[in-house]
Amino acid sequence: SVSLPLTLKELIEELSNITQDQTPLCNGSMVWSVDLAAGGFCVALDSLTNISNCNAIYRTQRILHGLCNRKAPTTVSSLPDTKIEVAHFITKLLSYTKQLFRHGPF
């Protein structure tokens, strides 16, 4: 299996590539602005799963699927009530992933 640091590095590279693309991401689709501190990669995946027919984030979805660990006893206390553009969401996710990679257990 691929090591965790490499998977995180792959996600960072993928998210970086997406943010550098100037074209509107997923035709300007909106996603739930979830609390990454509370739910991590699992809630990020949940939010992005609601987007279909967007090849640009397919690889991100696949990587998140591998990083999400459903059995972790974490819970998001409140349901998200705000939607943001996918591009903004990707930027937040990139920041979250970078701090994990820099200060992870590796």
Epitope: S1, S3, L4, A37, L67, N69, S95, H103
Partner: antibody
Framework: EVQLVESGGDLVQPGRSLKLSCAAS????????MAWVRQAPTKGLEWVAS????????YYRDSVKGRFTISREKAKSSLYLQMDSLRSEDTATYYC????????????WGQGVMVTVSA | DIVLTQSPALAVSLGQRATISCRAS??????????MHWYQQRPGQQPKLLIY???YLASGIPARFSGSGSGTDFTLTIYPVQADDIATYYC?????????FGGGTKLELN
């Protein structure tokens, strides 16, 4: 239901070896980082060692480095702690735990197994 | 190593508020993410995760428990205290290895 069952605890003399085992069930063992946390009698908790889900990466506290070896066996869904050159200060209850690398906490815990190092 | 300091004991009455503190020898907050967690250990049992990342309730934990804080100062609050809350409470950091725990605060009844 997640279950972690430790075994192998014993009374041993200083300088001797002991191997602890932890049988995991109720979850996909190969998805999880695992760890050992110990608790000396009437004392607090102390992280001992962790291992990545693929078993490749291992992490130890300085006081056990070179003496303890953490390992895992996917086929048996088991975690191990080989303890060599045991010292009296290693006397403790040893807990097998799942370790959530993303959030940094120890989520599921076994009941613990007692290791006593004494002449 | 990051040292986490907790007061050894706290006496409370049932139905009252218990405030347990944990002070870190250096900041455990990175990029707004608090790397501090709380556990409960009842006598003769294994520890149980209560709060993660300073303020988020682990699943199955009643809302009587709450957490707050950032940087070096963190607090676990129990309100109202019930009989089965009598236990020792530990904070734990994952800012840097070795992952360390506080010495524990024993919650006792008045």
């Amino acid at each position: 239901e997640v279950q972690l069952v430790e075994s192998g605890g014993d009374l041993v003399q200083p300088g001797r070896s002991l191997k602890l085992s932890c049988a995991a069930s109720g979850f996909t063992f190969s998805d999880y980082y695992m760890a050992w946390v110990r608790q000396a009698p009437t004392k607090g908790l102390e992280w001992v060692a962790s291992i990545s889900n693929d078993g490749i990466s291992t992490y130890y506290r300085d006081s056990v480095k070179g003496r303890f070896t953490i390992s895992r066996e996917k086929a048996k869904s088991s975690l191990y702690l080989q303890m060599d050159s045991l010292r009296s200060e290693d006397t403790a209850t040893y807990y097998c735990t799942t370790w959530n690398w993303e959030f940094g906490f120890f989520d599921y815990w076994g009941q613990g197994v007692m290791v006593t190092v004494s002449a | 190593d990051i040292v986490l300091t907790q007061s050894p004991a706290l006496a409370v009455s049932l139905g009252q508020r218990a405030t347990i503190s944990c002070r870190a020898s250096q900041s455990v907050t990175i990029s707004r993410y608090n790397r501090m967690h709380w556990y409960q250990q009842r006598p003769g049992q294994q520890p149980k995760l209560l709060i993660y990342r300073s303020s988020y309730l682990a699943s199955g934990i009643p809302a009587r428990f709450s957490g707050s804080g950032s940087g070096t100062d963190f607090t676990l609050t129990i309100y109202p205290v019930q009989a089965d809350d009598i236990a020792t409470y530990y904070c734990q950091q994952n800012r840097e290895s070795p992952w360390t725990f506080g010495g524990g605060t024993k919650l006792e009844l008045n």
